[in-house]
Interface confidence: medium
């Protein structure tokens, strides 16, 4: 396969609700009609797949119904949102992009986005 450059932010801080968003941008060498985006999580040298979606250019990304990811695409950019994150989910989230069709097949893997998740402090008891 042929290599392709993928860019993503180095660091993202998840919101207090456990939501993190980042942009994954790929340098498309051709006119791909079918693109697959996969989010991988690397922690303690273990790599696991968080979510994946295949989309046709010009259409929305469609993740599985039970996926913790949502996303939108615009040209060679994919806006990814990961939900339901907790402190234990802190880690390096890698964006992998594959230009599936038409040939040639291209594969690009980003350097990863370090997502920091801080669990919110529990609310103090109210006097009311």
């Amino acid at each position: 396969c042929k290599a392709m450059h993928v860019a993503q932010p180095a660091v993202v801080l998840a919101s207090s609700r456990g939501i993190a968003s980042f942009v994954c941008e790929y340098a498309s060498p051709g006119k791909a009609t079918e693109v697959r985006v996969t989010v991988l999580r690397q922690a303690d040298s273990q790599v696991t797949e968080v979510c994946a979606a295949t989309y046709m250019m010009g259409n929305e990304l469609t993740f599985l119904d039970d996926s913790i990811c949502t996303g939108t695409s615009s040209g060679n950019q994919v806006n990814l949102t990961i939900q339901g994150l907790r402190a234990m989910d802190t880690g390096l989230y890698i964006c992998k992009v594959e230009l599936m069709y038409p040939p040639p097949y291209y594969l690009g893997i980003g350097n990863g986005t370090q997502i920091y998740v801080i669990d919110p402090e529990p609310c103090p008891d109210s006097d009311f």
Epitope: R36, P103, P104, Y105
Partner: antibody
């Protein structure tokens, strides 16, 4: 040189199953996507299925989805097509093809004939 | 699916003739078009890919051109071994689809 050799064809009754194999040599099999294409007697060419180089992704034509499954074993340099619920209209020569980095189907096997008849 | 209309479906020509086969697609395919040659009882062979690029080992008398939805295969000087059936195929969008074929026969 690139060589693709299909096997497993034959005469089978409607509703039955058959598995085709394609032995690849002369290139690094695990680096290439592979496809099956068929040709009914006296007719044109029809794409059947494709599988990615690693086997992670597969695609099937609407006419065979749910009945045929493409798979591969990179350790054996072999491509497969599992065919079930066969119909008379599946009668054809089945070709194994390699998908090059830059285009579709640059090399083809000699084909194996599948005849579905009672 | 993208429909492929190939014409003519058959033609008769003599050795040395210039032969042109056309392929029209139902959608723009941005040059993602191949041409194959098939002889009776044999597997198809790739002749031209990406509209105009000659596959390795294919004689230079074969050439391809076109854009958008209209594509052409030309054999500049027909040779005895060129009598065969020719198919166009698009791979711009899944599923890849083939034209109905053009049979080139001896006049």
């Amino acid at each position: 040189q690139v060589q693709l050799v299909e096997s497993g064809g034959g005469v089978v009754q409607p509703g039955r199953s058959l598995r085709l194999s394609c032995a690849a040599s002369g290139f690094t099999f695990s680096n290439y996507a592979m496809s099956w294409v068929r040709q009914a007697p006296g007719k044109g060419l029809e794409w059947v299925a494709e599988i990615s180089y690693s086997g992670t992704y597969s695609y099937h034509s609407d006419t065979v989805t749910g009945r045929f499954t493409i798979s591969r074993d990179n350790s054996k340099n072999t491509l497969y097509l599992q065919m079930s619920s066969l119909r008379a209209e599946d009668t054809a020569v089945y070709y194994c093809t390699r998908r090059d980095y830059d285009n579709e189907m640059d090399y083809w096997g000699q084909g194996t004939l599948v005849t579905v008849s009672s | 699916d993208i429909q492929m209309t190939q014409s003519p479906s058959s033609l008769s020509a003599s050795v040395g003739d210039r032969v042109t086969i056309t392929c029209r697609t139902s959608q723009v395919i941005t040059n993602y078009l191949n041409w194959y040659q098939q002889k009776p009882g044999k597997a198809p062979k790739l002749l031209i890919y990406y509209t105009s690029r000659l596959h390795s080992g294919v004689p230079s008398r074969f050439s391809g051109s076109g854009s958008g939805t209209d594509y052409t295969l030309t054999i500049s000087s027909l040779q005895p071994e060129d009598f065969a059936t020719y198919y166009c195929q698009q791979f711009g969008k899944r599923p890849p689809t083939f034209g109905g074929g053009t049979k080139v026969e001896i006049k």
